[in-house]
Interface confidence: low
């Protein structure tokens, strides 16, 4: 599996999409997990509804939500109030029994606020002398990592 990069802005929500073959994964629940180390386990963050027919219902765990379009074949994960510590490797999974197939490997990168023109940690809007805790990009920029490319999340 290639790794797809999704970039979001600190404090904003980020949407991650994982397309899949709806026929191949018919009847299967899905999950979103965080990779613990390069070869470590993938720790479950949130999974779709226990009843597969209700997979379209959004389920939350803390600031992470999951919803599944089982007909269209798209799993969508929303990370609200994105923080630098959310950066890292994740997986979208299709569950069957105690097994899990990887649908997509995802690298989440957390960018500084796009309106933060200063080097300091304060988040700022152009023309302001005060700092504001500002954040706003749901503009999931996604790209695939090339083989051997080292992910370096540009966190601030």
């Amino acid at each position: 599996h290639n790794t797809t990069v999704f970039q979001g802005v600190a404090g904003q929500s980020l949407q991650v999409s994982c397309p899949y073959d709806s026929m191949k994964h018919w009847g299967r629940r899905k999950a979103w997990c965080r990779q613990l180390g390069e070869k470590g386990p993938c720790q479950r963050v949130v999974s779709t509804h226990n009843l597969w027919l209700l997979s379209f219902l959004r389920r939350w765990n803390g600031s992470t939500a999951i919803t599944d379009d089982t007909l269209g074949g798209t799993l969508t994960i929303t990370l609200r109030n994105l923080q630098p510590h959310d950066a890292g490797l994740y997986q979208c999974q299709s569950l069957h029994g105690s097994e899990a197939d990887t649908l997509r490997k995802v690298l989440v990168e957390v960018l500084a606020d796009p309106l933060d023109h200063r080097d300091a940690g304060d988040l700022w809007f152009p023309g302001e002398s005060e700092s504001f805790e500002d954040a706003h990009v749901e503009h999931s920029i996604s790209r695939s990592l090339l083989e051997g490319e080292i992910p370096f999340p540009p966190t601030s």
Epitope: Q12, P114, D119, F125, P126, G127, D134, A135, H136, E138
Partner: antibody, heavy 118, light 112 residues
Framework: EVKLLESGGGLVQPGGSLRLSCAAS????????MSWIRQPPGKAPEWLGV??????????EYNTSVKGRFTISRDYTQNILHLQTNTLRAEDTAIYYC?????????WGQGVMVTVSS | DIVMTQGALPNPVPSGESASITCQSS???????????LNWYLQRPGQSPQFLIY???TRASGVSDRFSGSGSGTDFTLKISSVEAEDVGVYYC?????????FGSGTKLEIK
């Protein structure tokens, strides 16, 4: 899919008022800064103002060209952005756009025409 | 206010060839953090502007890699390689360094 749909434009006499609206969908409206931008026929866009997100109290900034006459507000329960325009002048004739603000104006509505004429 | 000045394209560009659109700012848009706060937009005939480039050279989501931005603190270029019919329209640069945000007057791209 992000969608912005403006309404409320039309013909108004000099000195009159109009309230423009922008219905937003496809994203978490309260998380984003939103702007109004206008474009006179055949000319470049002009940024009018911005309203911050919920985390920053929906506070506003304006271009000096409209400050005191135009007011931006938002109804976050209905996902609607508003622009109240007062004491309109002939030079305010333009297409008015609402736009989402991220690294720039990443999504724009289709625009609504405001004509100020007697 | 920062004034943005755009140059005109002298002639219609032959389809398949490249086009370069220039923009100048009255003040450097290069910040001490290393980013240059210059955006590009395309407004196709009868449509709203579309976000193309931010931070001078970063393509917005979904924008073709035929579009590339470059420049210094005050002089900027948008290059469109292998122009196609869908590239026709008016291109605007915009400074994002300080309020009020200001746009250039626009550069019209026509194709032969």
């Amino acid at each position: 899919e992000v969608k912005l749909l403006e309404s409320g434009g039309g013909l108004v006499q000099p000195g009159g008022s109009l309230r423009l609206s922008c219905a937003a969908s496809g994203f978490t409206f309260t998380d984003f800064y939103m702007s109004w931008i206008r474009q006179p026929p055949g000319k470049a866009p002009e940024w009018l103002g911005v309203i911050r997100n919920k985390a920053n109290g929906f506070t506003t900034e304006y271009n000096t060209s409209v400050k005191g006459r135009f007011t931006i507000s938002r109804d976050y329960t209905q996902n609607i952005l508003h622009l109240q325009t007062n004491t309109l002048r002939a030079e305010d004739t333009a297409i008015y756009y609402c736009a989402r603000l991220t690294y720039g104006f990443d999504y724009w509505g289709q625009g609504v025409m405001v004509t100020v004429s007697s | 206010d920062i004034v943005m000045t755009q140059g005109a394209l002298p002639n219609p560009v032959p389809s398949g060839e490249s086009a370069s659109i220039t923009c100048q700012s009255s003040k450097s848009l290069l910040h001490s953090n290393g980013k240059t706060y210059l955006n590009w937009y395309l407004q196709r005939p009868g449509q709203s502007p579309q976000f193309l480039i931010y931070w001078m050279s970063t393509r917005a989501s979904g924008v073709s890699d035929r579009f590339s931005g470059s420049g210094s603190g005050t002089d900027f270029t948008l290059k469109i390689s292998s122009v196609e019919a869908e590239d026709v329209g008016v291109y605007y640069c915009q400074q994002f360094l300080e309020l009020p945000f200001t746009f250039g007057s626009g550069t019209k791209l026509e194709i032969k």
